[in-house]
């Protein structure tokens, strides 16, 4: 089975760890695919190790373990993320994470101060 935090949040400009945990008494992991919606983020395989898709190579760092660290987050990164575990002989298991990227606290504070500042 796949165990993961269903919903996570992080600040714009910050980073977040995407993590799925696979547990099985018999099956061994042979490959893990990570996707942002339908777009490939990175792949790990026992044979080849990690490959980060070129589109994300400046913002995605493999690990910890079979997870990913996603850096320099933008509001556009809000959405669904999927891990797909290819196992032998168990088959394919999928996990889903929803990431909400929020405005940084600095931005929120700045906006609040601006809104409450007296005119003139």
């Amino acid at each position: 089975t796949i165990d993961t935090k269903r919903n996570i949040s992080a600040e714009e400009g910050g980073s977040v760890i995407l993590q799925c945990h696979f547990s099985s008494d018999t099956a061994e992991v042979t490959q893990v695919d990570w996707k942002q919606q339908d777009q490939l983020l990175a792949i790990y395989s026992v044979d080849l190790g990690w490959h980060v898709a070129s589109v994300f190579s400046d913002r995605v760092v493999p690990g910890p373990s079979l997870g990913l660290t996603f850096q320099s987050l933008t509001m556009n990164d809000t959405g669904e993320y999927f891990c797909t575990y290819h196992t032998y002989p168990g088959g394919i298991y999928k996990g889903r994470i929803f990431l909400k990227v929020q405005e940084s606290s600095d931005d929120r504070n700045g906006l609040a101060q601006f809104q409450t500042a007296p005119l003139g």
């Epitope: 490959q31 996707k35 339908d38 792949i43 044979d47 490959h51 898709a53």
Partner: antibody, heavy 118, light 107 residues
Framework: EVQLLESGGGLVQPGGSLRLSCAAS????????MHWVRQAPGKGLEWVAA????????SYADSVKGRFTISRDNSKNTLYLQMNSLRAEDTAVYYC???????????WGQGTLVTVSS | DIQMTQSPSSLSASVGDRVTITCRAS??????LNWYQQKPGKAPKLLIY???SLQSGVPSRFSGSGSGTDFTLTISSLQPEDFATYYC?????????FGGGTKVEIK
Amino acid sequence: EVQLLESGGGLVQPGGSLRLSCAASGFTFSSYSMHWVRQAPGKGLEWVAAIKSSGSSTSYADSVKGRFTISRDNSKNTLYLQMNSLRAEDTAVYYCARVPYDYWLDYWGQGTLVTVSS
Amino acid sequence: DIQMTQSPSSLSASVGDRVTITCRASQSISSYLNWYQQKPGKAPKLLIYAASSLQSGVPSRFSGSGSGTDFTLTISSLQPEDFATYYCQQSYSTPLTFGGGTKVEIK
């Protein structure tokens, strides 16, 4: 530098057999799935067969199933395609290709021409 | 089997033109879509993998987009060495299948 070098092509009569080889160098051959793809003269690309890194799993196009056998010898860094009961429609340039993560074909050999004709 | 339909089958363009080639899958293939360039007498060369990732060493004028069933290869400014035939290919399931190709010719 990654290199794939096919050999074994040639002229064969219908019903005959050929064995193609693909010698790999410049990478850890035993870590990659390998595929064969063919291209008939003046036509597009057609996938033929695939084999996983360990050789434990293979798959074939319906058009060659039961006639062609893909295999590999990781100790020799070599991929093979045994072609039996050849038909005129098997005439093509045959390419071997490296396939990381079973996803994309990132390096191809130069191809070897197989001509099936009486 | 998943059918891959490419359009147009051929096009004429000039150096400097922006060229767009489309590929449609007969069912959803997520982002399991790759693009290749082939010149006469040569083996295909990988340009774009996973729908939008540029293969190492490929010029940045090539880009890919799309997911599901509809995909696009764009050459932002056509160069003399780009006149060739381009193929899309799905790796969502076996048998792997290729589009019929798009031949880019000099106008």
